[in-house]
């Protein structure tokens, strides 16, 4: 938690941010909360980015004030105007770009005082894996596919029955560049699959970790996937 101390007689207010990650091409949220004020017209929100001359976004007197907004953020930012009064200064960032990564400052002025907090924003690509069974003449393989990752992740297979086993010798992973030439499709194939077992395909980079599980029996196949963003730290 970072508390900004007051200058020239004004009190400080507590501003809290959470480090987060944006998925390239999708919309992202830069989280920031502050001690609320009773009057919307007394609240000023400024978002700044280290190394960028113009503002990322400014909200004051109950509306956006974008005259000093930097070109790289033009038309891509918005605050949740109806939630500002309750202390939500989070910024919605549309169509996240790789270059949006960096250190952001959420700077707040209210009638109670002012405060700020920094936020580390990472950008990349991450997606849910899907694990399917492929059939050969008399054996099965598992195919784990995830459409969009960046930077290039690691892929590790695990199994419930053979806990701690290393499947690198019986698996093959490939990365195929997508059409926008940044993100990549991840495909990993696991050979020598045995029935009555649950396998996990774990894909991880420095931004996210995703797991696709598949339970394989004679009579059914059950799948489950989940994705977790890494390094979500509060400041």
């Amino acid at each position: 938690l970072i508390i900004g101390f007051g200058i020239s007689g004004r009190h400080s207010i507590t501003v809290t941010t959470v480090a987060s990650a944006g998925n390239i091409g999708e919309d992202g949220i830069l989280s920031c909360t502050f001690e609320p004020d009773i009057k919307l017209s007394d609240i000023v929100i400024q978002w700044l980015k280290e190394g960028v001359l113009g503002l990322v976004h400014e909200f004051k007197e109950g509306k956006d004030e974008l005259s000093e907004q930097d070109e790289m953020f033009r038309g891509r930012t918005a605050v949740f105007a109806d939630q500002v009064i309750v202390g939500n200064a989070s910024l919605r960032l549309k169509n996240v770009q790789l270059t949006d990564a960096g250190t952001y400052k959420c700077y707040i002025i209210t009638s109670k005082g002012k405060g700020n907090a920094n936020l580390e924003y990472k950008t990349g690509a991450f997606s849910m894996p899907e694990v399917n069974v492929d059939y050969n003449a008399s054996s099965e393989t598992l195919r784990c596919e995830a459409p969009r990752w960046f930077p290039q992740p690691t892929v590790v297979w695990a199994s419930q029955v053979d806990q701690g086993a290393n499947f690198s010798e019986v698996s093959n992973t490939s990365f195929e560049l997508n059409s926008e030439n940044v993100t990549m499709k991840v495909v990993s194939v696991l050979y020598n699959v045995t029935i009555n077992n649950t396998y996990s395909c774990m894909i991880e980079n420095d931004i996210a970790k995703a797991t696709g599980d598949i339970k394989v029996t004679e009579s059914e196949i059950k799948r489950r996937s989940h994705l977790q963003l890494l390094n979500s730290k509060a400041s």
Epitope: V133, Y135, I195, V216, E218, S219, E220, I221, R223
Partner: antibody
Framework: QVQLKQSGPGLVQPSQSLSITCTVS????????VHWVRQSPGKGLEWLGV???????DYNALFISRLSISKDISKSQVFFKMNSLQADDTAIYYC???????????WGQGTTLTVSS | DIVMTQSQKVMSTTVGDRVTITCKAS??????VAWYQQKPGQSPKLLIH???RRYIGVPDRFTGSGSGTDFTLTINNVQSEDLADYFC????????FGAGTMLELK
């Protein structure tokens, strides 16, 4: 090469029973289940039942009272028996290999059954 | 039981055409759907499993798609040897089949 070969009678009288043997090659019944499916012009393809690799069975609820499936792993044979046959049991009966997740992949050549007096 | 409905009983086509056969499940079956081809006097032959994955040796002109309740089998550049009956089947529970679609020449 995976093969399922069926043998059984072509004509059975009403109220009698049907017995079909499915002899498999190219895979072991210790590792694969075998389904039974029938096909008739009136009802299309109908799943009848399955014997799993471990020997347990599942049956279509419509046939559970008159159907039994068993196997002899050492002879690579699966046995199908259906009792109390009626004219509407006239169909082609197939044995089919099971794959992981209940997928039916390799089919026998079929046994054509006519139930008639 | 889950009912698989193939509304097209017969589809007429010409060699080289593209044809799409549809199948609807009475409830959500995820992608646990297979497609079979059956020629007269022969046993059904597995073409597609998991709704969209081609089985071993199946030509790439056969494509499956769909999930949930709506599924399609598309045959691109139809060949004379493709004239047959096509059945969809769900195997998320005890298997049930569609009534079939016969592909014939115009």
């Amino acid at each position: 090469q995976v093969q399922l070969k069926q043998s059984g009678p072509g004509l059975v009288q009403p109220s009698q029973s049907l017995s079909i043997t499915c002899t498999v090659s190219g895979f072991s019944l210790a590792n694969f289940g075998v389904h039974w499916v029938r096909q008739s012009p009136g009802k299309g393809l109908e799943w009848l039942g399955v014997i799993w690799s471990g020997g347990s069975t599942d049956y279509n609820a419509l046939f559970i009272s008159r159907l039994s499936i068993s196997k002899d792993i050492s002879k690579s044979q699966v046995f199908f028996k259906m009792n109390s046959l009626q004219a509407d049991d006239t169909a082609i009966y197939y044995c089919v290999r099971n794959r992981v997740g209940r997928l039916l992949d390799s089919w026998g050549q079929g046994t054509t059954l006519t139930v008639s007096s | 039981d889950i009912v698989m409905t193939q509304s097209q009983k017969v589809m007429s086509t010409t060699v080289g055409d593209r044809v799409t056969i549809t199948c609807k499940a009475s409830q959500n079956v995820d992608t646990v759907v297979a497609w079979y081809q059956q020629k007269p006097g022969q046993s059904p032959k597995l073409l597609i499993h998991s709704a969209s994955r081609r089985y071993i040796g199946v030509p790439d002109r056969f494509t499956g798609s769909g999930s949930g309740t709506d599924f399609t089998l598309t045959i691109n550049n139809v060949q004379s040897e493709d004239l047959a009956d096509y059945f969809c089947q769900q195997y998320s529970t005890n298997p049930t089949f569609g009534a079939g679609t016969m592909l014939e020449l115009k």
